[in-house]
């Protein structure tokens, strides 16, 4: 009955253990699922997170090649070069200058293309308009792209179009053969014929920039 | 001995699941250190991402700011008037325009003044060096903005600023007196004094539009 | 070259008139006025006026208003000067110069006026 | 009348020497100034205008500064034929008024 009482006594001491042991492991299973729900939780804000900052990243992508489009623009509409150089003249889509030596038509035509551009070439009478106006204060004869070979020939302008008959009528030595060629200058507002070796002032033409106006 | 023998299983049977229990409670230790550990990292991912949200939406604030910015000055130079209006030349930092009227100086300083303009005004020695050779292959003489009540009265430009003598020296009548005044012209480079009532062309000048340029 | 020739000495009673003479050349006569200058014995220069050849008009200083008459023939590039009503003090060398500042000047004529 | 005085009216001074003479203008002039030299029975000869500018063929040891109302002529190193009367005149305004003139003397 000692052996007994002694095991009883164990088995009291080893029950309480036990049931201390159990109550240790529930209160640490509730802990661990509060813990996993903590964790759930965190998780969720990680996502969270993660996704915002995503976000924010295609945002500033977003923003930043806005930025680079606005700063592109601005660099091409800043030069927004003037629609003529300087000490040209800008009247509807082109550019002219008179140029203030004397050559002959070759040497006028040479000067032209080094600045980027022809000798004048009159489109339309509102052209003509411009011309007969700009140089009115003038009585000194100005070379334009206009030129032939000799009377069997058609009169052509420097990009090879033909001269319409109804802008303006030629005046001068329209039927006369010169080595050089024949052509055309304008002077007080009329268009006349003449050795091309001779030397006159010149009216230079070109497009104007008026991509950025 | 027989309670005794079941005492002794009993007490088996508990030890056995003390020490199932004790092992429980030691795995679930390691896994609640591990959780804790793993809830620490969670910590600190969030701790990370939320320091890179809060970069990110400076970033962009900076961003968006700089886009407002850029838009503002594009609106601002898309608009990029040309530097000076049509007809007009071009030249440094100033437009000029050259009449195709001729009139008095009074009535030829209106006409500048309606155009935003002012007669022309020579500051220095490449404005005029400018000026004499956009007027070459002119034999008129054009009015420019400067004038003398009568030879007791200094020359004067229309803002009221007196002729520096280094810039040109005044040819024609420079010591009559007119009752309209004297005022200067501009002929083949050279500047005369002459009576205001007669008539001349006449070179209007304005400032450049440059802000864009 | 530019030169201005004017007319020889003077003498000439007090009272009455003289007129200086003064040829240009070298330049477009019409394009710059001529001063007149005067320089009294041992004295210095007294500026008289000018006349513009172009338009043919004069101006004239305060003190010789009404006595000093200034002219020109542009057909012979020549200005004048005339003086009337002398005295003694008229006595001087005049010059003729073109053009402000003065460039070119003549060589003078001495006008001597004495009773 | 705009009064023009010069200073000194003599001065006497040796070759090779820097010689500095005056104008004093009774109001601004911006300038319009020039500087002639007379020798003696001679035309005076324009020497400076604008009050800085060397007139062509004029040797380059004269030079003229100032502004406003004061104005100077330098000869920056006196030669035996600079011997003369130097007289400056405005030319701003009628009556163009000359400087009663300064006699330079070789010492």
């Known amino acids: 009955s000692q052996v007994s009482n002694l095991l009883k006594q164990q088995q009291t001491n080893l029950t309480h253990q036990k049931n201390k042991l159990e109550g240790q492991i529930s209160a640490r299973q509730q802990a661990e699922e509060a813990s996993q729900e903590s964790q759930n939780e965190l998780k969720e804000m990680i996502e969270t997170l993660a996704w915002k900052l995503n976000e924010k990243s295609k945002e500033q992508m977003e923003l930043h090649h806005q930025n680079l489009n606005l700063q592109e623009t601005l660099k091409r509409v800043a030069n927004c070069s003037a629609p003529c150089p300087q000490d040209w003249i800008w009247h509807e889509e082109n550019c002219y200058l008179f140029s203030t030596g004397s050559f002959n038509w070759e040497k006028s035509q040479e000067k032209c293309l080094s600045l980027d551009a022809k000798l004048l070439k009159i489109n339309s009478t509102a052209d003509l308009d411009f011309i007969q106006q700009a140089i009115s204060y003038s009585s000194f004869p100005f070379w334009m792209g206009l030129s032939r070979r000799n009377p069997s020939y058609p009169w052509l302008w420097e990009d090879g179009s033909p001269l319409m008959p109804h802008l303006f009528r030629i005046r001068g030595a329209v039927s006369q053969t010169y080595p050089s060629g024949t052509c055309a200058y304008i002077q007080r507002g009329a268009v006349y014929a003449e050795n091309c070796i001779l030397a006159a002032f010149s009216i230079c033409q070109k497009k104007a920039n008026l991509r950025a106006q | 001995s027989q309670v005794s023998n079941l005492l002794k299983q009993q007490q088996t049977n508990l030890t056995h699941q003390k020490n199932k229990l004790e092992g429980q409670i030691s795995a679930r230790q390691q896994a609640e250190e591990a959780s804790q550990e793993s809830q620490n990292e969670l910590k600190e991912m969030i701790e990370t991402l939320a320091w890179k949200l809060n970069e990110k939406s400076k970033e962009q604030m900076e961003l968006h700011h700089q886009n407002l910015n850029l838009q503002e000055t594009l609106k601002r130079v898309a608009n990029c008037s040309a530097p000076c209006p049509q007809d007009w030349i071009w030249h440094e930092e100033n437009c000029y325009l050259f009449s195709t009227g001729s009139f008095n100086w009074e009535k030829s300083q209106e006409k500048c003044l309606s155009l935003d303009a002012k007669l022309l005004k020579i500051n220095s020695t490449a404005d005029l060096d400018f000026i004499q050779q956009a007027i070459s292959y002119s034999s008129f003489p054009f009015w420019m903005g400067l004038s003398r009540r009568n030879p007791s009265y200094p020359w004067l430009w229309e803002d009221g600023s007196p002729l520096m003598p280094h810039l040109f020296r005044i040819r024609g009548a420079v010591s009559q007196t007119y009752p309209s005044g004297t005022c200067a012209y501009i002929q083949r480079g050279a500047v005369y004094a002459e009576n205001c009532i007669l008539a001349a062309f006449s070179i209007c000048q304005k400032k450049a539009n440059l802000r864009a340029q | 070259q530019v030169q201005l020739v004017q007319s020889g000495a003077e003498v000439k009673k007090p009272g009455a008139s003289v007129k200086v003479s003064c040829k240009a050349s070298g330049y477009t006569f019409t394009d710059y006025e001529v001063h007149w200058v005067r320089q009294a014995p041992g004295q210095g220069l007294e500026w008289m006026g000018a006349i513009h050849p172009g338009s043919g008009g004069a101006a004239y200083v305060q003190k010789f208003q009404g006595r000093v008459t200034m002219t020109r023939d542009t057909s012979i590039s020549t200005a004048y000067m005339e003086l009337s009503r002398l005295r003694s003090d008229d006595t001087a060398v005049y010059y003729c110069?073109?053009?402000?500042?003065?460039?070119?000047w003549g060589q003078g004529t001495l006008v001597t006026v004495s009773s | 009348d705009i009064q023009m005085t010069q200073s000194p009216s003599s001065v006497s001074a040796s070759v090779g020497d820097r010689v500095t003479i005056t104008c004093r203008a009774s109001q601004g002039i911006t300038n319009w100034l020039a500087w002639y030299q007379q020798k003696p029975g001679k035309a005076p000869k324009l020497l400076i205008y604008?009050?800085?500018i060397l007139e062509s063929g004029v040797p380059s040891r004269f030079s003229g500064s100032g502004s406003g109302t004061d104005y100077t002529l330098t000869i920056s190193s006196l030669q035996p034929e600079d011997i003369a009367t130097y007289y400056c005149q405005q030319y701003l305004i009628t009556p163009y008024t000359f400087g009663q003139g300064t006699k330079l003397e070789i010492k």
């Open positions: 110069a073109r053009w402000l500042p003065m460039d070119y």
């Open positions: 604008a009050a800085s």
